[in-house]
Interface confidence: low
């Protein structure tokens, strides 16, 4: 059956889009490149502005296969740098601590609850 508007805000479809398109530098065609570029920038802004990471949290980038994981090995970037706590210059407060998962240096809240929360309350 056709997907409804609400379906696109369910965690699974939201997660699927993020995993497939975020930082996907090897798309099959130009149309996909446009979408991937848009998805990447949207997620970057979302994670930076809302101080969140992934759909459910940083573990999304560890548990699932993703374009991001294909492009970045786990030791260097367990999750995108946008998941790190930033200073006023939008640079990671402590990149190494963020990569190591030291509490206070990365955002452990998923973005889905921040986006869906206000919608679900109406």
């Amino acid at each position: 059956t056709a997907a409804t508007q609400q379906d696109f805000f369910t965690p699974n479809l939201f997660l699927k889009q993020m995993l497939e398109r975020y930082q996907n530098n090897s798309p099959p065609n130009n149309d996909d490149q446009w979408k991937n570029n848009g998805v990447t920038k949207t997620w970057d802004r979302l994670m930076l502005q809302d101080n969140c990471c992934g759909v459910n949290g940083p573990s999304d980038w560890q548990k699932y296969t993703s374009a991001f994981r294909t492009e970045n090995n786990d030791a260097d970037y367990p999750w995108p740098r946008q998941c790190c706590v930033m200073n006023n210059l939008k640079e990671p407060l402590n990149l190494e601590a963020c990569k190591l998962g030291v509490p206070g240096f990365y955002h452990n809240q998923g973005c889905y609850e921040l986006i869906s929360g206000p919608m679900n309350r109406h």
């Epitope: 530098n25 130009n30 149309d31 570029n37 920038k41 970045n72 260097d76």
Partner: antibody, heavy 118, light 113 residues
Framework: QVLLQQSGPQLVRPGASVKISCKAS????????IHWVKQRPGQGLEWIGM????????SFNQKFKDKATLTVDKSSSTAYMQLSSPTSEDSAVYYC???????????WGQGATLTVSS | DIVMTQSPSSLAMSVGQKVTMNCKSS????????????LAWYQQKPGQSPKLLVY???TRESGVPDRFIGSGSGTDFTLTITSVQAEDLADYFC?????????FGAGTKLELK
């Protein structure tokens, strides 16, 4: 096919602002960064900066930060570079080129010759 | 800034000879995330715009003759033309796109004897 068509040669007086255009066709304009490169005879190639047509985000070589202004018109799939207060040092061939994210330049414009002379 | 040092600045070769030119970067161009070297080689014929030959240091661009071979990793890179042809008369230069500002080698001018 992919084509980056640049504006023709220009002769300008020192101090008079100049704008060079780069019209893209044959691909999704907002999917690739547009770069600008300067080439002076016997002086090699210099990267000026780049612009992301999807949101007009720019990144510059600090050397050209106060010299070049990069803009795009998405409706016509055209990128522009404006050079302020040109001097004879700005006389060169200027190329536009495209890249996908931080990848190589796979297509280049034919070059636009700028001559600054009184 | 990453400095790209290209050598030699010029060389004269006869048709059929093997040509080797080098590019050395002031820092590594190897992205440890994907094990790719962010270096490309271009050919520029007189009066023309540059043409992509090789990217990621060793991947030949589609349509480029297989006599053009890119090699190297880290800071040292080589472009080899296994059997030079008359139409290969041109300037060749490398580009690093590992970090901004993007920087080019000064170029190698290939002339025919």
């Amino acid at each position: 096919q992919v084509l980056l068509q640049q504006s023709g040669p220009q002769l300008v007086r020192p101090g008079a602002s100049v704008k060079i255009s780069c019209k893209a066709s044959g691909y999704s304009f907002t999917s690739y960064w547009i770069h600008w490169v300067k080439q002076r005879p016997g002086q090699g190639l210099e990267w000026i900066g780049m612009i992301d047509p999807s949101d007009s985000e720019t990144s510059f070589n600090q050397k050209f930060k106060d010299k070049a202004t990069l803009t795009v018109d998405k409706s016509s799939s055209t990128a522009y570079m404006q050079l302020s207060s040109p001097t004879s040092e700005d006389s060169a061939v200027y190329y536009c080129a495209r890249s996908y994210y931080a990848s190589r330049f796979d297509y280049w414009g034919q070059g636009a010759t700028l001559t600054v002379s009184s | 800034d990453i400095v790209m040092t290209q050598s030699p600045s010029s060389l004269a070769m006869s048709v059929g000879q093997k040509v080797t030119m080098n590019c050395k970067s002031s820092q590594s161009l190897l992205n440890s995330n994907n094990q790719k070297n962010y270096l490309a080689w271009y050919q520029q014929k007189p009066g023309q715009s540059p043409k992509l030959l090789v990217y990621f240091a060793s991947t030949r661009e589609s349509g480029v003759p297989d006599r053009f071979i890119g090699s190297g990793s880290g800071t040292d890179f080589t472009l080899t033309i296994t059997s030079v042809q008359a139409e290969d008369l041109a300037d060749y230069f490398c580009l690093q796109h590992y970090g901004t500002p993007l920087t080019f080698g000064a170029g190698t001018k290939l002339e025919l004897k």
